[in-house]
């Protein structure tokens, strides 16, 4: 999950698998002040997880939401 | 370092159900992704599903749905995989296998449980 | 659902090298994994995310993706290598991890 900090949330560490794609209701990236820089997917529970943004399962993700 | 221990072999009549169990010891097993695949005999291997942790959610393959339950006992960090309505074609060798954080992709797994099914 | 197609073997002699091949609808867009398996053991992973090894797996062993084509590559190949291979992606549209069909090397 992203850390806090000053409420601009950052990642300090990705998530490496994939996440069910249906799990996934909508997406952030984090702030251009975080060390790393992330996208954050939030589930259908409300759960936030940090992904790297170049890897291509990411990429696919965020190209599938936009277009829903 | 991490280990998958399986329980033994079993021997089924058709239309009966099986529980396969998973022991993992060297890390707790709320902290990975647990799957299970399985192998007929002379074949290739076959993803059944698996558990996701980040949303605390178990995900089936459409082939084993309804058929299939995968359950975790965290307190001895043991994983269970219940196979019903037992047919022929289910005999098999089912492994478990974690997915752990990092690097991706399916490691190390159990050594393997072979069922058998047979009237 | 995503398939995956392998060539069902491949043959190569001592010090060579072998190509093993995974066919699949614009595979240049997913992560392929691969996993050698042994007589009576359990698979172990080679290579993950298209081409990089877990530790503990020789250099030997590399990995590629491009188009509709991943590849397993085992360079000065031993005895030891021969095995089953898999490769495996994640199929986002099923949320299923999807397997292929193995390919046996054989060490002539």
């Known amino acids: 999950s992203p850390y806090s900090s000053d409420t601009t949330p950052c990642c300090f560490a990705y998530i490496a698998r994939p996440l069910p794609r249906a799990h996934i209701k909508e997406y952030f990236y984090t702030s251009g002040k975080c060390s790393n820089p992330a996208v954050v997917f939030v589930t259908r529970k409300n759960r936030q997880v940090c992904a790297n943004p170049e890897k291509k399962w990411v990429r696919e993700y965020i190209n599938s939401l936009e277009m829903s | 370092q991490v280990q998958l221990v399986q329980s033994g072999a079993e021997v089924k009549k058709p239309g009966a159900s099986v529980k396969v169990s998973c022991k993992v010891s060297g890390y707790t097993l709320n902290d990975f992704a647990m799957h299970w695949v399985r192998q007929a005999p002379g074949k290739g291997l076959e993803w059944m599903g698996g558990y996701v942790p980040e949303d605390g959610d178990t995900i089936y393959a459409q082939k084993f749905q309804g058929r299939v339950t995968m359950t975790e006992d965290t307190s001895t960090d043991t994983a269970y995989m219940e196979l019903s309505s037992l047919r022929s074609e289910d005999t098999a060798v089912y492994y478990c296998a974690t997915d752990p954080l990092y690097p991706p992709g399916l490691q190390p797994w159990g050594q393997g449980t072979t069922v058998t099914v047979s009237s | 659902s995503y398939v995956l197609t392998q060539p069902p073997s491949v043959s190569v002699a001592p010090g060579q090298t072998a190509r093993i091949t995974c066919g699949g609808n614009?595979?240049?867009?997913?992560?392929v994994h691969w996993y050698q398996q042994k007589p009576g053991q359990a698979p172990v992973l080679v290579v993950y995310?298209?081409?990089d090894r877990p530790s503990g797996i020789p250099e030997r062993f590399s990995g590629s993706n491009s188009g509709n084509t991943a590849t397993l590559t085992i360079s000065r190949v031993e005895a030891g290598d021969e095995a089953d291979y898999y490769c495996q992606v994640w199929d986002s549209n099923t949320d299923h991890w999807v397997f292929g069909g193995g390919t046996k090397v054989t060490v002539l």
């Open positions: 995310d298209d081409s």
């Open positions: 614009n595979i240049e867009s997913k992560s």
